[in-house]
């Protein structure tokens, strides 16, 4: 009797199914959808969360499914297929042969086509902007104490490493927090800034994908800090090609 | 990238015997903890055997004395030898490049898969 036997969880995905029967009496922590055993240790790949996001139960999911055409708020909600490391394969293709390439957080960089689509290499998002608006408050936040807090919420809830967090802007009421993390600065074990993303944006929803922990409750100098609005803006190592019919639209 | 190719699988009677291959290629093959891991249809995947960089071996109960799992460092190759199978035994069979931590088993990457069926 183990103590992996006695707090077989998953601290750091609540999707997923855990048993103690893997190798030596250690628990196991199955993706749902995907059926990979994850680290727990760490934050799970956006794409095997997007995959056990997909395969809940429909009447599970809290969020209705927009449309092809959406333009803003589009969850960007889609089965991913996965590479065998968990991370999107850079070509993604729809139940009706419609194809599309992705890069590394999964949206689409390409207009969408046929099952003659080539996709070939997966392209690195290496710039994440997240623009935040805070409800009011009776004063601006200090903007020091803003940056700390921010960064401090990266390092320890997400396990990003400090260096990723580019920088972090503020003019009341709008928030941004600039990630930065080109292919070379990213080490064995480094949580990719795409996934770090991703908690941040269903922490933000009050949706998250920690396991029994409360949801987000983030304070500066004790003030609560509340967003109501959330844009997150993805800069690709290779810019995207879409056709000029769709710039122009 | 990691790459992992299954081969060997196919349809033997109970009672009969196949071996699976797994190609691996993409990381340093010697240095890493590698797995077996079937899914049966309409099941989850479940782990049956597990090997680590040194040579130790684990299995579950469930195939415990029929199923034997080795490598061959110098072809960056991992083989499952299936004795003895069961009806029950029929499942898509994947390998996996696999670690244990202080409490969990955790899997890295995985292969396609080959599927073995055991039918009379």
């Known amino acids: 009797h183990t103590a992996a036997q006695d707090n077989c969880t998953c601290p750091t995905n609540k999707m997923t199914v855990c048993s103690p029967d893997g190798p030596g009496g250690r628990c196991q922590c199955r993706a749902l959808g995907s059926g990979m055993a994850v680290d727990c240790s760490t934050l799970t790949s956006k794409c095997l969360l997007l995959k056990a996001r997909m395969s809940a139960p429909k009447n599970a999911r809290t969020l209705v499914r927009p449309s092809e055409h959406a333009l803003v708020d589009n969850d960007g909600l889609y089965d991913p297929d996965c590479d065998p490391e968990g991370r999107f394969k850079a070509r993604q293709c729809n139940q009706t042969s419609v194809c599309w390439c992705v890069n590394s957080v999964g949206v689409r960089r390409t207009d969408k086509g046929d099952l003659s689509l080539r996709c070939d290499e997966l392209v690195r998002t290496h710039h994440i902007l997240i623009d935040l608006r805070h409800r009011p408050t009776a004063g601006a936040f200090n903007h020091s104490d803003l940056d700390a807090e921010l960064r401090r919420l990266f390092r320890e809830r997400y396990r990003l490493h400090p260096k990723f967090v580019a920088a972090v802007h503020y003019e009341q009421p709008t928030i941004q927090i600039e990630l930065r993390q080109n292919t070379s600065q990213k080490a064995a074990g480094d949580v990719d800034i795409g996934d770090a993303a991703y908690y941040f944006e269903r922490d933000i929803k009050g949706e998250s994908l920690f396991q029994g922990r409360g949801g987000l409750d983030l304070r500066v100098r004790g003030e609560p800090l509340q967003v109501e609005r959330t844009l997150i803006y993805y800069l690709d190592e290779i810019p995207p090609k879409f056709s000029m019919k769709r710039l122009t639209a | 990238q990691v790459q992992l190719q299954e081969s060997g699988g196919g349809l033997v009677q109970p009672g009969g015997s196949l071996r699976l291959s797994c190609a691996a290629s993409?990381?340093?093959?010697?240095?890493?903890?590698m797995s077996w891991v079937r899914q049966a249809p309409g099941k989850g995947p479940e782990w049956v055997s597990y090997i680590t960089s040194g040579g130790t071996t684990y299995y579950p109960d469930t195939v415990k004395g029929r199923f034997t799992i080795s490598r061959d460092n110098a072809k960056n190759t991992l083989y499952l030898q299936m004795n003895s199978l069961k009806p029950d035994d029929t499942a898509l069979y994947r390998c996996?490049?696999?670690?244990?931590?202080?409490?969990?088993?955790?899997?890295?990457?995985w292969g396609q898969g080959t599927q073995v069926t055991v039918s009379s």
């Open positions: 996996a490049k696999s670690r244990l931590t202080d409490s969990h088993y955790v899997e890295d990457a």
């Open positions: 993409g990381f340093t093959f010697s240095g890493s903890d």
